[in-house]
Amino acid sequence: MVPPPENVRMNSVNFKNILQWESPAFAKGNLTFTAQYLSYRIFQDKCMNTTLTECDFSSLSKYGDHTLRVRAEFADEHSDWVNITFCPVDDTIIGPPGMQVEVLADSLHMRFLAPKIENEYETWTMKNVYNSWTYNVQYWKNGTDEKFQITPQYDFEVLRNLEPWTTYCVQVRGFLPDRNKAGEWSEPVCEQTTHDETVPS
């Protein structure tokens, strides 16, 4: 009897949908695997007789529930199927946005770039897919624990009237208010403000 694949899970980030599993212990030899998806009542092969322990399902529609399955094979024998269901628009992880930061005197000017849909070669981003898309920004003085959060209205934001000659760190994530779903934070960007431009009277 061939044992089934173990720890079968979907690793999906920005709609790059990779089904992953682990090969079970099997004394007779090396196992191969076949992964399929359900398409209108019929299971279709996506990865056949592969020695890999992952299969790319990024071509599936972003909308609706999908049933995927994988089994292990050896010679003419095979394991039972292991099934999972997956809804990309609900389940995909929202990766970190890009962010450009520029210092102008005692202000930080930030521009945000929504993460690209990873399986496409054009300019569609996660912001296109999710109507309620917004950004959360958090910032703090470098070396301190207190963090401040803001929700910009647009793809840019300005933090004004900061302390001069002070390093501030900023990071951003995507947020979907209608789903109460947050994406991953970007890596912090730390910049030092310069002088206060206000002229004394």
């Epitope: 998806y37 398409s39 071509s59 529609s61 972003k62 909308y63 054009e122 296109n128 897919v129």
Partner: nanobody, 126 residues
């Protein structure tokens, strides 16, 4: 919400022509992949023709040279021009859309399209 509405089906003699249309609301054709599928009685739904956001097209072998898929982004309408129709083309024809898809690879599977119309019947018979 995306809605697709097919029209243009009907009864036609072998060798005749039909033009199917698919009007969309809540969606712009320039932003994704579109396709025509068909389902004959007792058979599975199958891909007929697809068109990507860049205008590139793919056809099932059984319709190559006879069918042409096109879209009018200004009218938000997808078309399927069907010439030299054969009895085996008889089926319910469905329009499908997958928003924010560039067509990095051909999509031929039902599971690769998220939105569907109700279908329009095409019957080829003498």
């Amino acid at each position: 919400q995306v809605q697709l509405q097919e029209s243009g089906g009907g009864l036609v003699q072998p060798g005749g022509s039909l033009r199917l249309s698919c009007a969309a609301s809540g969606y712009t054709y320039s932003s994704g992949c579109m396709g025509w599928f068909r389902q004959a009685p007792g058979k599975e739904r199958e891909g007929v023709a697809t068109i990507n956001s860049d205008g590139s097209t793919n056809y099932a072998d059984s319709v190559k040279g006879r069918f042409t898929i096109s879209k009018d982004n200004a009218k938000n309408t997808l078309y399927l021009q069907m010439n030299s129709l054969k009895p085996e083309d008889t089926a319910m024809y469905y329009c499908a859309a997958e928003p924010y898809c560039s067509g990095g690879y051909p999509r031929w599977s039902v599971a690769e399209f998220g939105y569907w119309g109700q279908g329009t019947q095409v019957t080829v018979s003498s």
